[in-house]
């Protein structure tokens, strides 16, 4: 079994303010097991976005079923765009581990850049 | 960290049902399958069925498949099996067990209750 | 329905020394590219932990020890060392359709 990657086709996403981002994210394994979170920005500074495994986020819907099997779509979407949520988004696979979850790949990111409203 | 808690131990006659619990936490519910296996004194591991919290869907062993009924409350993360029309045969310990790679599998378990069908 | 046997029923086996326990599938549970199965390890008194994932993938924090081959209808689990720890029943479980386990090895020491 070859190693998973984490592809994400699209280096660059532009959506008008107000709108709904889709970003893509695919992982070409089942194997590890383990959720995927999304994440804005890189290093210890980076800001989650949408955490598979547990949390509350609003704004953000997967575009497919994650309990379905065989699934190794992990896009999302972000509703309610604003100038405010530009930046680079990254998609990372996490492997099960005791008692934490354990980083384990990320794709290279995709950025996203806002249109402002024509007034 | 994902624990599954159980419900109490159960007494139960003849021709009785009895609906044991599993209370979940540490992950986001509707994101992962739940099982029910059960295992009788003594004996293997017996798959009941499976349910998608998300959106209910159910997969049952045929041999259960009239008599066990399987629901959720996400409101509370609650997973429920109830088996109708005990017999004696029907004495074991019920787990109930998280799905963590929607992979059919069964990563993180409950203790178990101990369901006891006695005239 | 695919049915799992496992053989032997029991063994035992001396402290340091190799276990094996074998899982045969009445039919292949390939698919999709991989091997739907899975094993499991009980003691007394404790739910099942799973220790090996899609055949051959080692589960959170299983020692490098276990370790799990095969493919098609033809299922190995292996203890290269065995420790006094490893006493247990040892299930294989498929989910090629939907689950079902084998009939379990009860492993001993000798």
């Known amino acids: 079994e070859e190693e998973l990657q984490v592809i994400q086709p699209d280096k660059s996403v532009l959506v008008a303010a107000g709108e709904t981002a889709t970003l893509r994210c695919t992982a070409t394994s089942l194997i590890p097991v383990g959720p995927i979170q999304w994440f804005r920005g890189a290093g210890p500074g980076r800001e989650l976005i949408y955490n598979q495994k547990e949390g509350h986020f609003p704004r953000v819907t997967t575009v497919s079923d994650l309990t379905k099997r065989n699934n190794m779509d992990f896009s999302i979407r972000i509703s309610n765009i604003t100038p405010a949520d530009a930046g680079t988004y990254y998609c990372v696979k996490f492997r099960k581990g005791s008692p934490d979850d354990v980083e384990f790949k990320s794709g290279a990111g995709t950025e996203l850049s806002v249109r402002a409203k024509p007034s | 960290q994902v624990q599954l808690v159980q419900s109490g131990a159960e007494v139960k006659k003849p021709g009785a049902s009895v609906k044991v619990s599993c209370k979940a936490s540490g992950y986001t519910f509707t994101n992962y399958w739940i099982n029910w296996v059960r295992q009788a004194p003594g004996q293997g591991l017996e798959w009941i069925a499976m349910i998608d919290p998300s959106d209910s869907e159910t997969h049952y062993n045929q041999i259960f498949k009239d008599r066990a009924t399987l629901t959720t409350d996400t409101s509370t993360s609650t997973a429920y099996m109830e088996l109708r029309s005990l017999r004696s045969d029907d004495t074991a310990v019920y787990y109930c067990a998280m799905d963590y790679g929607s992979l059919y599998a069964m990563d993180y378990w409950g203790r178990g209750t101990l369901v006891t069908v006695s005239s | 329905d695919i049915v799992l046997t496992q053989s032997p029923d029991s063994l035992a086996v001396s402290l340091g020394e190799r276990a094996t326990i074998n899982c045969r599938a009445s039919?292949?549970?390939?698919?999709?590219?991989?091997?739907?199965i899975f094993w499991y390890q009980q003691k007394p008194g404790q739910p099942p932990k799973l220790l090996i994932y899609?055949?051959?993938n080692r589960d959170s924090g299983v020692p490098d020890r276990f370790s799990g081959s095969g493919s098609g209808t033809d299922f190995t689990l292996t203890i290269s060392s065995l420790q006094a720890e490893d006493v247990a029943v040892y299930y294989c479980q498929h989910s090629r359709e939907l689950p079902t386990f084998g009939q379990g090895t009860k492993l001993e020491i000798k």
């Open positions: 899609l055949a051959s």
């Open positions: 039919q292949s549970v390939r698919s999709s590219g991989y091997n739907w």
